[in-house]
Interface confidence: medium
């Protein structure tokens, strides 16, 4: 007769491992007992369990409650056992020793491999600001056995670097994603992808990029000079900028306080019916946590009685 087993049995952490050992004997042969032992190199054999044809399944105290026979129906020549709830420490070499009558003893070895799926974590880097050089956007770490694969999935242009730390029964892999921040990256997803034989599908963690910036400010509303005349209603100036975080707007008048009746509504300055009092230099001040910008305009309110044309100067300053 001969023993049938597997060279390697692979299970995921927490699963039950079936350790196969089947005696394919000639007719009339009987299996008296099947002894299972852990036989890692450099250490003596440690009995796991013994299946006896008469006395049943005996389990070592070290494995109490964790070793069982497969569910019925059972073949009397089948010495396979189930190792419940496999842990990392179970990984190693096992030996099945079968005592048969009248043929004698047979033995076979197998290796139990316990896959430890990773639990990845993504850590964003420091705050990203437009104008920085190459900056860490995020790092992703995953520890498992065997070592997991960590990659990145994104439309954003950048560079990656990985490093690995080996532990006694596992390995931790950390991958970093570096980029040169620009405002076009705002809101773009950066996804860490972790692959491992113990996972049914890749694990993905997505980080949304936030890049701080503040665009140049400009003022709109003075495009048609002839509209700015005494008595005109609904005249307004609008301050244009964009930023991350979204900026706040403040209006002042350079050559004095804002005239009475002028309404400030965020980025918009609304005028009552125009008078010559409204002529002056108006400043839009745009700011966020990252930066601040100014844009100033000169308003000349025309008197229709006068022949002179309206003059408008636009000046931007950072």
């Amino acid at each position: 007769g001969e023993l049938e087993t597997s060279d390697v049995v692979t299970v995921v952490l927490g699963q039950d491992a079936k350790l196969p050992c089947f005696y394919r004997g000639d007719s009339g042969e009987q299996v008296g007992q099947v002894a299972w032992a852990r036989v890692d190199a450099g250490e003596g054999a440690q009995e796991l369990a013994l299946l006896h044809s008469k006395y049943g399944l005996h389990v070592s105290p070290a494995y109490e409650g964790r070793v069982e026979q497969p569910p019925p129906p059972r073949n009397p020549l089948d010495g396979s056992v189930l190792l419940r709830n496999a842990v990392q420490a179970d990984e190693g070499e096992y030996e099945c020793r079968v005592s048969t009558f009248p043929a004698g003893s047979f033995q076979a070895r197998l290796r139990l491999r316990v896959l430890v799926p990773p639990l990845p974590s993504l850590n964003p880097g420091p705050a990203l600001e437009e104008g920085q050089g190459l900056t860490l956007a995020a790092s992703c770490t995953a520890e498992g056995s065997p070592a997991p694969s960590v990659t990145w999935d994104t439309e954003v242009k950048g560079t990656t670097s990985s490093r690995s730390f080996k532990h006694s029964r596992s390995a931790a892999v950390t991958s970093e994603f570096h980029l040169v921040p620009s405002r076009s990256m705002n809101g773009q997803p950066l996804t860490c992808v972790v692959s491992h034989p113990g996972l049914l599908q890749d694990q993905r963690i997505t980080h949304i990029l936030h890049v701080s910036f503040l665009a140049e400010a400009s003022v709109r509303g003075l495009e048609d000079q002839n509209l700015w005349h005494i008595g005109r209603e609904g005249a307004m100036l609008k301050c244009l900028s964009e930023g991350q975080p979204p900026p706040s707007y403040n209006w002042t008048r350079l050559d004095g306080p804002l005239p009475s009746g002028v309404r400030v509504d965020g980025d918009t300055l609304g005028f009552p019916p125009l008078t010559t009092e409204h002529s002056g230099i108006y400043v839009c001040h745009v700011s966020n946590e990252f930066s601040s910008r100014d844009s100033q305009v000169t308003v000349d309110v025309l008197d229709p009685q006068e022949d002179s044309g309206k003059q408008v100067d636009l000046v931007s300053a950072s």
Partner: nanobody, 118 residues
């Protein structure tokens, strides 16, 4: 020939404890499995517990959690610690040992009486 000699039996009150011992005469062959059976008056001999050379154990459901089997391989001795004894545990307790050569050979002791009564 292997001789098995039991000791430690006696009279004990319900809820009490006893420890049985069984010493095997030295054999040139290692004893594979050692253990205990019991036989109450008018009943068939029933399995109690067994232990392998490597220390793996098996118990009858009726004693699991109350009885503990242990073994000293160097002395070829097996023990049965019996706790929380009940009236239905009253029986003659027999030591058994199996020797593996060309085939399994089972040896038996003469038994020791355990009586649980108030």
């Amino acid at each position: 020939e292997v001789q098995l000699v039991e000791s430690g039996g006696g009279l004990v009150q319900p809820g009490g404890s006893l420890r049985l011992s069984c010493a095997a005469s030295r054999s040139t062959f290692s004893l594979n499995i050692m253990g205990w059976y019991r036989q109450a008056p008018g009943k068939q001999r029933e399995y109690v517990a067994t232990i392998t050379t490597g220390g793996s154990t098996n118990y009858a459901d009726s004693v699991r959690g109350r009885f503990t089997i242990s073994r000293d391989n160097a002395e070829d001795t097996v023990y049965l610690q019996m706790n929380s004894l009940r009236a239905e545990d009253t029986a003659v307790y027999y030591c058994t040992a199996e020797l593996v050569r060309r085939g399994p050979t089972t040896y038996w002791g003469r038994g020791t009486q355990v009586t649980v009564s108030s």
